[in-house]
């Protein structure tokens, strides 16, 4: 058993049929010694008396808010949550496996630049009685500070018969050094509580590996005289790290016909313009990627050819 | 050339070669070994590779103030990785395919380090990998980790040279 926060405790249980469970001793936070009784949740049934209560925790029915009273007055509470371990593996019932970039990916994180700011998100089908708490650091043995905000519900989607909820959190490294080569990864830890079930999820990454620039901005076409060719130009996204002579991007320019089956013409360039042939009803799209480190491409920025 | 006296390197040449290094480092990884990389090893497996850290002056401001600190750090790293790529981790079994980009990568590391420090000039003592023989069964994982680490190192070096070529070239 360990303390998650004041008066909230997590009991770690090996979860299998007829498991013996864990013996837990609760102590009433009071100077009183006599006349103390214990109850669980809203029940008035007295579970025991005395300053300590010993219980055998085996299932969710044994978890909940234990309260000690004296003469009708509440003295203190202890909330017991369960953390299940099945076949040596901690349960992951609360969050959905996003399966990207690999199986057992519950947390996904992205950064728009090298400033040390990043966003993580996760998915669940649970709509109520759900709380999240997020902590982060750089490195684990001698951790350096990363400050995370509160997790918020950022999107709701309907997937077949189910509703899916996306939560996200923004974090900022306290003393970020954008130009340095990271040697210690960022660690993100999410505590999830659904009713009386506790689970924790972690992710470890370098900012460089989660970089995904915003799409290029101000995408414009300029027809070239007496030609089917156009000059496409664009700019670095505002959110990208500066100076651009240091934090450079590379770009992919694509000409795509109306039909998805039509052949795509692609050009790669380090410049912020390119000359392409604009076909009727086609569109021109541009996306960006760090020039020197193959992290994710941005989403496409697009304009119609006409 | 970034000779220890403090004169400027051939920024544009360094930029071109460091960008080529980035491309090679990504094409060399993941290496096609004789088997899949099955186990994620612990972090103790690789030597303590040199990293370009916050105080090394490789940020735009630091380069403007005095690029020598940064260039020396990059040079140390290039020599370190060049030695790693020549060690039995890469020359031993499971053998690299004859057309593996590692050979080119190795030569380019040497080429860039020589651009930074021509024959006859010496910066202070290098950080050299302490290389005891690597067991064949460890090598695929070691290669994977070294190349991952090299990708990060050469990305920073390439940014330095790109910025230098754009803003510090005579």
């Amino acid at each position: 058993i360990w303390e998650l926060k004041k008066d909230v405790y997590v009991v770690e249980l090996d979860w299998y049929p007829d498991a013996p469970g864990e013996m837990v001793v609760l102590t009433c936070d009071t100077p009183e010694e006599d006349g103390i009784t214990w109850t669980l949740d809203q029940s008035s049934e007295v579970l025991g008396s005395g300053k300590t209560l010993t219980i055998q925790v085996k299932e969710f029915g044994d978890a909940g808010q234990y309260t000690c009273h004296k003469g009708g007055e509440v003295l203190s509470h202890s909330l017991l949550l369960l953390h299940k371990k099945e076949d040596g593996i901690w349960s992951t019932d609360i969050l959905k496996d996003q399966k990207e970039p690999k199986n057992k990916t519950f947390l996904r994180c992205e950064a728009k630049n090298y400033s040390g700011r990043f966003t993580c998100w996760w998915l669940t089908t649970i709509s109520t009685d759900l709380t999240f708490s997020v902590k982060s650091s750089r490195g684990s043995s001698d951790p350096q500070g990363v400050t995370c905000g509160a997790a918020t519900l950022s999107a709701e989607r309907v997937r077949g018969d189910n509703k899916e909820y996306e939560y996200s959190v923004e974090c900022q490294e306290d003393s970020a050094c954008p130009a340095a080569e990271e040697s210690l990864p960022i660690e993100v830890m999410v505590d999830a509580v659904h009713k009386l079930k506790y689970e924790n999820y972690t992710s470890s990454f370098f900012i460089r590996d989660i970089i995904k620039p915003d799409p290029p901005k101000n995408l414009q076409l300029k027809p070239l005289k007496n030609s089917r060719q156009v000059e496409v130009s664009w700019e670095y996204p505002d959110t990208w790290s500066t100076p651009h002579s240091y934090f450079s991007l590379t770009f992919c320019v694509q000409v795509q016909g109306k039909s998805k089956r039509e052949k795509k013409d692609r050009v790669f360039t380090d410049k912020t313009s390119a000359t392409v042939i604009c076909r009727k009803n086609a569109s021109i799209s541009v996306r960006a990627q760090d020039r020197y480190y193959s992290s994710s491409w941005s989403e496409w920025a697009s304009v119609p050819c006409s | 050339r970034a000779v220890p006296g403090g004169s400027s390197p051939a920024w544009t040449q360094c930029q071109q070669l460091s960008q080529k290094l980035c491309t090679l480092a990504w094409s060399a990884h993941p290496l096609v070994g004789h088997m899949d990389l099955r186990e994620e090893g612990d972090e103790e497996t690789t030597n303590d590779v040199p990293h370009i850290q916050c105080g090394d002056g490789c940020d735009p401001q630091g380069l403007r103030d005095n690029s020598q600190f940064c260039l020396q750090r990059i040079h140390q790293g290039l020599i370190f990785y060049e030695k790693l790529l020549g060690s039995d981790i890469f020359t031993g079994e499971p053998s690299l395919l004859p057309d593996s980009p590692v050979g080119q990568l190795h030569a380019s590391l040497l080429g860039l380090s020589q651009l930074l420090q021509p024959e006859g000039h010496h910066w202070e003592t290098q950080q050299i990998p302490s290389l005891s023989p690597s067991q064949p069964w460890q090598r695929l994982l070691l290669r994977f980790k070294i190349l991952r680490s090299l990708q990060a190192f050469v990305a920073v070096a390439a940014r330095v040279f790109a910025h230098g070529a754009a803003t510090l070239s005579p």
Epitope: - | H34, M35, S87, G92, G103, W137
Partner: antibody, heavy 116, light 107 residues
Framework: EVQLQQSGPELVKPGASVKMSCKAS????????MHWVKQKPGQGLEWIGY????????NYNEKFKGKATLTSDKSSSTAYMELSSLTSEDSAVYYC?????????WGQGTTLTVSS | DIVMTQSPATLSVTPGDRVSLSCRAS??????LHWYQQKSHESPRLLIK???QSISGIPSRFSGSGSGSDFTLSINSVEPEDVGVYYC?????????FGSGTKLEIK
């Protein structure tokens, strides 16, 4: 075509030393390890050690430490093995071999006879 | 050291037979196992690498299988020129060790 050409047979007296060579051609000498293997008459194969010609790093079978010394010369793409304090137990055929898993290139062997 | 045990020590076969040579390692060596053929007065020749990978120029009748500590070299239709001693080799860890060999004879 990859070839490993070993030096000719040696007849030496007990207590003496001998240095045999293995000249590599048809590939980049510094790109692979060079192993050395011992085979006593009518017996099996025993690994002595290897040299990495790129950095002259060596790795020996404990059994041959102090007995064998591996060196190489990049300029001539040649690997060498010196055997010291020779006894009749050292009489054998000695092979050089490039990385085991690349085409299995072995030299033709150098026969060493130790006899008074 | 990893001990490589080969069986049988000698195998007498008729041309056209399918034969299996066994090699056992004293501890797991994953698939880091190589097979060699050595004919009289010749250098060893690599037949199979990494337990089952074929080598160019080696006839397709030679195949390998196994992983961990048990390995097999199969010759699916023995030819008279296949006589010689067959060695397996631990390529997993130092010191590299060879089996004592299986001598293949033609009846």
């Amino acid at each position: 075509e990859v070839q490993l050409q070993q030096s000719g047979p040696e007849l030496v007296k007990p207590g003496a030393s001998v240095k045999m060579s293995c000249k590599a051609s048809g590939y980049t000498f510094t790109r692979y390890l060079m192993h050395w293997v011992k085979q006593k008459p009518g017996q099996g194969l025993e690994w002595i050690g290897y040299i990495n010609p790129y950095n002259d790093g060596t790795n020996y079978n404990e059994k041959f430490k102090g007995k064998a010394t591996l060196t190489s010369d990049k300029s001539s793409s040649t690997a060498y093995m010196e055997l010291s304090s020779l006894t009749s137990e050292d009489s054998a055929v000695y092979y050089c071999a490039r990385n085991w898993d690349v085409g299995g290139y072995w030299g033709q062997g150098t026969t060493l006879t130790v006899s008074s | 050291d990893i001990v490589m045990t080969q069986s049988p020590a000698t195998l007498s076969v008729t041309p056209g037979d399918r034969v299996s040579l066994s090699c056992r390692a004293s501890q797991s060596i994953s698939d880091y196992l190589h097979w060699y053929q050595q004919k009289s007065h010749e250098s060893p020749r690599l037949l199979i690498k990494y337990a089952s990978q074929s080598i160019s120029g080696i006839p397709s009748r030679f195949s390998g299988s196994g992983s961990g500590s048990d390995f097999t070299l199969s010759i699916n239709s023995v030819e008279p020129e296949d006589v010689g001693v067959y060695y397996c080799q631990n390529g997993h860890s130092f010191p590299f060790t060879f089996g004592s060999g299986t001598k293949l004879e033609i009846k």
